[in-house]
């Protein structure tokens, strides 16, 4: 009976529940448009289960299709500010290894102060995701306004 | 041997496929910025599988990491209206128990009439999520324009 | 022995990991507001695992609750263009079978040049999803700016 019940079961590990939700740590120095992320329970509601951070960039540990999502809010911003500083653009992409470098997700702020989006994309073990914010405006570090995450969806 | 192996496996039910998608019922009375939600097949394409509604607010029944998503469209709105009534802000947060109260997701409308976003966050059984819309503008009740949902992702 | 072991696990297929991420192929001829999609590894990072394309529209192959997401960026666009061509609206809906025709997701561009959103919705085998872009503005074909996808979440 117990064995029959076990028939319907699935090894937990093989579900590949890799998931991460990060909060903004800081922006890069001049000429470095990357955002630097941090995560972990000590920091609040951010976490990494599987993926890792490498110098503030997210590195994937398991091959598969992932849902990648991001929200970035500009810190001192009104629709006037946003349009005056246009173009302010956010791009999420694979930045290493260089052979796999590609832009996955791109959004411009235009007259808004927040962008938010998500997409499904294949990622491979070792892929490092970078989030580039071009323009002079500063992103908010509030954890409910700026965040970045990935969720493994299927092999 | 076979039984020991089965131990490491997981009953399908315990995958925790908790999920809900809600449609707007109504806004709160004055001084109550909360949106009140409703769900169920009789209402159209909204549903609750696991989570429950408690006086129009969503209560979580299973611990885990959830993908929370929301879209809110303002009802009588143009970019002029939106900027004139600025700031109109939507915040999604845990509102009870009070000890776990926190803002999870925050967006302002600026010159737009729709906000949409999503994020991963840990939620615990008993957490109630509230969605607060500040400002004088009214949200659309159209089910394709305003909705709020959660999806259990992993333990 | 190997077969007996397999008994205890859940066939990968039965998890219903249906998923698709599509890139824009082209817009429709005049009087046809539909966007026509394409997908497959030869095209880059788009793919179909389960769902199929039928004349550029996405057809569902498995009943269940799906996460539907979309991002559309207008090609030659500034906040001025967007407001001058207002209303430019994107709607995602079930367009066939006719008996199940319904709008699932609707967003207007107002003064922005990108819309992005997602929602959970029940879909049935045979449902075809259409994405209608009304207005005269052209969507970007860049794969990081315009994409449309679905992910099976639960039965």
């Amino acid at each position: 009976q117990r064995f029959a019940q076990a028939q319907q079961q699935l090894p937990l590990e093989s579900l590949g529940w890799d998931v991460a939700e990060l909060q903004l740590n800081h922006t890069g120095p001049q000429q470095d448009p990357r955002l630097y992320w941090q995560g972990g329970p000590a920091l609040g509601r951010s976490f990494l289960h599987g993926p890792e951070l490498d110098k503030g960039q997210l590195r994937i540990h398991r091959d598969g299709i992932y849902m990648v999502h991001i929200q970035v809010t500009l810190a001192i911003c009104s629709s006037t500010t946003a349009s005056r500083h246009h173009p302010t653009t956010l791009a999420v992409g694979i930045c290493s290894p260089a052979s796999r470098s590609i832009s996955l997700l791109r959004l411009s702020f235009h007259q808004g102060c927040t962008i938010a989006s998500q997409r499904l994309t294949p990622l491979a073990r070792g892929d490092t995701l970078c989030t580039n914010l071009t323009g002079t405006l500063l992103p908010s570090r509030n954890t409910d306004e700026t965040f970045f995450g990935v969720q493994w969806v299927r092999p | 041997q076979r039984f020991a192996q089965a131990q490491q496996q997981l009953p399908l039910e315990s995958l925790g496929w908790d999920v809900a998608e809600l449609q707007l019922n109504h806004t709160g009375p004055q001084q109550d910025p909360r949106l009140y939600w409703q769900g169920g097949p009789a209402l159209g394409r909204s549903f609750l599988h696991g989570p429950e509604l408690d006086k129009g607010q969503l209560r979580i029944h299973r611990d885990g990491i959830y993908m929370v998503h929301i879209q809110v469209t303002l009802a009588i709105c143009s970019s002029t209206t939106a900027s004139r009534h600025h700031p109109t802000t939507l915040a999604v947060g845990i509102c009870s128990p009070a000890s776990r109260s926190i803002s999870l997701l925050r967006l302002s409308f600026h010159q737009g009439c729709t906000i949409a976003s999503q994020r991963l966050t840990p939620l615990a059984r008993g957490d109630t999520l509230c969605t607060n819309l500040t400002g004088t503008l009214l949200p659309s009740r159209n089910t394709d324009e305003t909705f709020f949902g959660v999806q259990w992702v992993r333990p | 022995q190997r077969f007996a072991q397999a008994q205890q696990q859940l066939p990968l297929e039965s998890l219903g990991w249906d998923v698709a991420e599509l890139q824009l192929n082209h817009t429709g001829p005049q009087q046809d507001p539909r966007l026509y999609w394409q997908g497959g590894p030869a095209l880059g990072r788009s793919f179909l695992h389960g769902p199929e394309l039928d004349k550029g529209q996405l057809r569902i192959h498995r009943d269940g609750i799906y996460m539907v997401h979309i991002q559309v960026t207008l090609a030659i666009c500034s906040s001025t263009t967007a407001s001058r061509h207002h209303p430019t609206t994107l709607a995602v809906g079930i367009c066939s079978p006719a008996s199940r025709s319904i709008s699932l997701l609707r967003l207007s561009f107002h003064q922005g040049c990108t819309i992005a959103s997602q929602r959970l919705t029940p879909l049935a085998r045979g449902d075809t999803l259409c994405t209608n872009l009304t207005g005269t503005l052209l969507p970007s074909r860049n794969t990081d700016e315009t994409f449309f996808g679905v992910q099976w979440v639960r039965p």
């Epitope: 000429q31 | - | 082209h26 030659i76 074909r141």
Partner: antibody, heavy 120, light 107 residues
């Protein structure tokens, strides 16, 4: 108002490498809203797109020239450059640098063009 | 690559004439299509983008239409400053390609 200006030698010997630089003023390459292209036009002939570069350094080249072309960017100088190796007389053309939107390939700003002659 | 074939390669017309220039794409490109004008010794200049949208500052006598593979540029009443070479270009996929031009000369 964005302006583009090509510079480089007007005469290159066959089998050598053609090198041109485009200096951008009135817009910052690093702002990230545009692709920066090279386009050429042999005397009395068609326009041919050579390739583009983005501020990040990512490139795309015309397959017909890909094996010989390198486009690079120097964001600190607000410049991008073209190198075309192993040139022949068929590479004699007016070379233009141009800007196109990221979201749509419309060449809305051009340099005035520079004639490069390949001859010994 | 997508080939763009322009016709005619040249035409003679008088001031006030209605002029049409055609361009055919070797495959369907939807509305991802543009027209440019080039005068001798100058760089090309955008006239029409996205098949039928008039670039800012371009006179309304210029108009564009198309069907996904066949495109037409129309000058409703030719003016002296319109004598030039006109190029079509596809923005559907890289490599971006141009037609070989139509030279509009004075009759």
């Amino acid at each position: 108002q964005v302006q583009l200006q090509e510079s480089g030698p007007g005469l290159v010997k066959p089998s050598q490498t053609l090198s041109l630089t485009c200096t951008v003023s009135g817009d910052s390459i690093i702002s990230g809203g545009y692709y920066w292209s090279w386009i050429r036009q042999p005397p009395g002939k068609c326009l041919e797109w050579i390739g583009y570069i983005f501020y990040s350094g990512s490139t795309d080249y015309n397959p017909s020239l890909k094996s010989r072309v390198t486009i690079s960017v120097d964001t600190s100088k607000n410049q991008f450059s073209l190198k075309l190796s192993s040139v022949t007389a068929a590479d004699t053309a007016v070379y233009y640098c141009a800007r196109s939107g990221y979201s749509y390939a419309l060449f809305d700003a051009w340099g005035q063009g520079t004639l490069v002659t390949v001859s010994s | 690559d997508i080939q763009m074939t322009q016709s005619p390669s040249s035409l003679s017309a008088s001031v006030g004439d209605r002029v049409t220039i055609s361009c055919r794409a070797s495959q369907f490109i939807g509305r991802y299509f543009n027209w440019y004008q080039q005068k001798p010794g100058k760089a090309p200049k955008v006239l029409i983008y996205a098949e039928s949208s008039l670039q800012s500052g371009v006179p309304s006598r210029f108009s564009g239409s198309g069907s996904g593979t066949e495109f037409t540029l129309t000058i409703s009443s030719l003016q002296p400053e319109d004598f030039a070479t006109y190029y079509c270009q596809q923005s559907y996929s890289t490599p971006w390609t141009f037609g070989c031009g139509t030279k509009v000369e004075i009759k």
